[in-house]
Interface confidence: medium
């Protein structure tokens, strides 16, 4: 969903996380059990460099289950 070099920062990052994770909520840093690069948070990964939808979704809370 991103072009090369595009980044998400500040309010746009929060806005987009609220949208992508709308059914779950989100974290600014991944829970340690799910972290691949534990020293990094979403700001570093998506604002300081470009990130993609798959990476954004790793910051969503536990996936929702339908009833």
């Amino acid at each position: 969903a991103y072009g090369p070099g595009e980044t998400l920062c500040g309010g746009e990052l929060v806005d987009t996380l609220q949208f992508v994770c709308s059914d779950r909520g989100f974290y600014f840093s991944r829970p340690s059990s799910r972290a691949n690069r534990r020293s990094r948070g979403i700001v570093e990964e998506c604002c300081f460099r470009s990130c993609d939808l798959a990476l954004l979704e790793t910051y969503c809370a536990t996936p929702a289950k339908s009833e």
Partner: antibody, heavy 115, light 105 residues
Framework: QVELVESGGGLVQPGGSLRLSCAAS????????MSWVRQAPGKGLEWVSY????????GYADSVKGRFTISRDNSKNTLYLQMNSLRAEDTAVYYC????????WGQGTLVTVSS | DIVLTQPPSVSGAPGQRVTISCTGS????????VHWYQQLPGTAPKLLIY???KRPSGVPDRFSGSKSGTSASLAITGLQSEDEADYYC?????FGGGTKLTVLG
């Protein structure tokens, strides 16, 4: 006051293309994410696509992924939806809606896909 | 996939109170804000309630929203003929199936 005006709908054959526009006024356009939401005749609302306020992120419903492209021109206060490879099931009224809460909607533009 | 379930239809007489439910799983309705939209016949949807219970300016206080557990509800008191419409709940990009409100008489 906030106003969203869609245009570009019409009759198109299956496999064809259309480009919808949504002209915005009455608010700070570049501060709001925007979405397209559609409603098939006699049916409920279905979110189609989203674009963040600077255009850095775009998202799509599975039903249109790979066929539709959302974009925005922040110098013209205009939102677009390029629709390719149209199918009969894409027939609907298409609305543009503001923000993540969809707090304002346009009047809609009808897209009919039929041979 | 997330599913938000609404009754297809509800009805009430003028002046009565009606409620419309929106049911989902604890991980969506229980965690996230629910919004409600009103769609009068032949018109575009309009935001009626946002963030579970907040009313945008211009929406009468006859309309109220609440959330408890895995359900959200829209209540309309002092029902009027002009309230006859379709009502949708949503969690951002996911909409319920809609409820048609009929005002009797």
């Amino acid at each position: 006051q906030v106003e969203l005006v869609e245009s570009g709908g019409g009759l198109v054959q299956p496999g064809g293309s259309l480009r919808l526009s949504c002209a915005a006024s009455g608010f700070t356009w570049s501060s709001f994410a925007m979405s397209w939401v559609r409603q098939a005749p006699g049916k409920g609302l279905e979110w189609v696509s989203y674009i963040s306020y600077l255009g850095s992120y775009t998202g799509y419903a599975d039903s249109v992924k790979g066929r539709f492209t959302i974009s925005r021109d922040n110098s013209k206060n205009t939102l677009y939806l390029q629709m390719n490879s149209l199918r009969a099931e894409d027939t609907a009224v298409y609305y543009c809606a503001r923000g993540t809460k969809f707090d304002y909607w346009g009047q809609g533009t009808l897209v009919t896909v039929s041979s | 996939d997330i599913v938000l379930t609404q009754p297809p239809s509800v009805s009430g007489a003028p002046g009565q109170r009606v409620t419309i439910s929106c049911t989902g799983s604890s991980s969506n309705i229980g965690t996230y804000d629910v919004h409600w939209y009103q769609q009068l016949p032949g018109t575009a949807p309009k935001l009626l309630i946002y963030s579970n219970s907040k009313r945008p300016s211009g929406v009468p206080d006859r309309f109220s929203g609440s959330k408890s557990g895995t359900s959200a509800s829209l209540a309309i008191t002092g029902l009027q003929s002009e309230d006859e419409a379709d009502y949708y709940c949503s969690i951002t990009r996911v909409f319920g199936g809609g409820t048609k409100l009929t005002v009797l008489g």
